[in-house]
Interface confidence: low
Amino acid sequence: IPVIEPSVPELVVKPGATVTLRCVGNGSVEWDGPPSPHWTLYSDGSSSILSTNNATFQNTGTYRCTEPGDPLGGSAAIHLYVKDPARPWNVLAQEVVVFEDQDALLPCLLTDPVLEAGVSLVRVRGRPLMRHTNYSFSPWHGFTIHRAKFIQSQDYQCSALMGGRKVMSISIRLKVQKVIPGPPALTLVPAELVRIRGEAAQIVCSASSVDVNFDVFLQHNNTKLAIPQQSDFHNNRYQKVLTLNLDQVDFQHAGNYSCVASNVQGKHSTSMFFRVVESAYLNLSSEQNLIQEVTVGEGLNLKVMVEAYPGLQGFNWTYLGPFSDHQPEPKLANATTKDTYRHTFTLSLPRLKPSEAGRYSFLARNPGGWRALTFELTLRYPPEVSVIWTFINGSGTLLCAASGYPQPNVTWLQCSGHTDRCDEAQVLQVWDDPYPEVLSQEPFHKVTVQSLLTVETLEHNQTYECRAHNSVGSGSWAFIPISAGAHTHPPDE
């Protein structure tokens, strides 16, 4: 950081005095201060001397020394007061321009620090400050009007008490400009429009800004429309509104409409599309497959997208069977509107029960007629297995029935010992049945298959297990002969 000599924060001298300010840094240094006469600047490598042999009140100000090569940007400053009994103020600028809500520094520098207690800020010709003028004073910098308002654009004077009388500075004109944050704010309604040929339509384009100087226009495709403009002022904003009224729309009115507003800050535009149709329409679609498979006990949301004009006059979800005659609860049906002409309808089916498999239909109606979209919901079940011993054509046979969805696969295992389930170490033989007989296969129901294992002799101390599995899970049934040789013969006929 550069060092200034004399090493004091403030220096007070009389007019006509010689003042020498020396700044020393590691590298080259530069002085910065108020524009004032009579200064001589002498630079020598890492030092710079600012001097005058005839100080005047206009030399009052803060002199800052910086080292341009210092990456930390360090600086040192000294404030010089040239106390002139006739000139209590050194005004650095006679016009100050700020935006609303900025602080406005009126740069009248006090030439004598002892006068600080008696300073005040007034409007020219001694008029008091406006109400709400919130200001502070620094003898080094001047008066600061905090968060200046447009209405405070006035001519001001700084006042100091000298020998019992007020001495004024020259006037400073403050210009407070309205903040124009950017191009005007825009609205174009509706965001989308559909009408049947011959119907009436209205498109409203409006723009607003804190400043009155802006333009707004509405264009159809690339043609600027001649529409009378309504102007208004409220909430401290200027508003301009263009309203396009069409009594009977035709196909040539369709297309892209753009609302465009511009000011000195730039241009904003927003667009909408106007569709003209021959007649009412109603389209139903779903992003989901209309054939759904869900594991029993799980939940499912069925979603239907509706595009319609005019609006829907009715809609509902219906269960078409084949099981109970229950209907979906209204609380499980939810409707959301994406925009004026597109809607999404959702049917929530939580924790599905066997009786809830089947067809679900969404029906909607508007002046264009009825439309329906039907989902087919099949429930998946893990296999349930049972095994019985019987004789078929005189042969001892184990008969395994497996029921589930999707259709289960069947595997037989023979293992040593009596067990509820064969483990790998016990397995003696494995038979896969690639084509079990399908006993029943109705839509929305479980598929029941049957597999036969012909066993001439049921071995003592062994277990026969039928295992079935599908994509949901697996099931098994272990058959344990009651005693050696039991049921090895066909029953008497």
Epitope: V98, Q102, D103, R131, H132, W140, H146, R147
Partner: antibody, heavy 126, light 107 residues
């Protein structure tokens, strides 16, 4: 990240002088518009503003305590020091330092405390 | 000095409630008012400045309104972390002065 931390004695005797130091990081008190202030809160009572010091060494004091308070800054150490003379048991309080800043516009320092320290409890008792 | 009268001094509310705290200035302070949140053992946190401007990082459920002498802090839907003490500060004129604080407790 802006942080401020107050330090000083937890206990002072009546008539003694209290010296509190606010050590901060994440900003510089040489930046235009920046300031640091001191606030205190006696147990069960409202907060009371004590003093502010600005980047340009401008100082403001609460008039009710002005003849007892001195605020100063050491920008090289990133510290602000508050001294309070002639301490009395009614000065028992939690003392906070807080930042005022940074600048919003080229000529507009903010005028409120935006970051505070956690406070230090000072008890005045013999 | 400008006196800041804050009310209520305490209130009990439940999560989800709308809470309103007011500060009344003894004279016109334009919009030079800030609102803070204070939790035990923690540093006060700035919520609102210039009466209605939301400080960066503060949830939008906090809002401030008012100008002149009457000011309001509103929490639109009280959350568990909002139970704390709230106070206002006028920085319009020296000496800067604070409201007495409002303690928001769980009902």
């Amino acid at each position: 990240e802006v942080t401020l931390k107050e330090s000083g004695p937890a206990l002072v005797k009546p008539t003694q002088t209290l010296t509190l130091t606010c050590t901060f990081s994440g900003f510089s008190l040489t930046t235009y518009g920046m300031g640091v202030g001191w606030i205190r809160q006696p147990p069960g009572k409202a907060l009371e503003w004590l003093a502010n010091i600005w980047w340009d060494d401008d100082k403001y004091y609460n008039p009710s305590l002005k003849n007892r308070l001195t605020i100063s800054k050491d920008t090289s150490k990133n510290q602000v020091v508050l001294t309070m003379t002639n301490m009395d048991p009614v000065d028992t309080a939690t003392y906070y330092c807080a930042r005022i800043g940074p600048i919003k516009y080229p000529t507009a320092p903010y005028r409120y405390f935006d970051f505070w320290g956690q406070g230090t409890m000072v008890t005045v008792s013999s | 000095d400008i006196q800041m009268t804050q009310s209520p001094s305490s209130l009990s509310a439940s999560v989800g409630d709308r809470v309103t705290i007011t500060c009344l200035a003894s004279e016109d302070i334009y919009d030079n008012l800030a609102w803070y949140q204070k939790k035990p053992g923690k540093a006060p946190k700035l919520l609102i400045y210039y009466a209605s401007s939301l400080q960066d990082g503060v949830p939008s459920r906090f809002s401030g309104s008012g100008s002149g002498t009457d000011f309001t802090l509103t929490i639109s839907s009280l959350q568990p972390e909002d139970f704390a003490t709230y106070f206002c500060l006028q920085d319009s004129e020296y000496p800067w002065t604070f409201g007495g604080g409002t303690k928001v407790e769980i009902k």
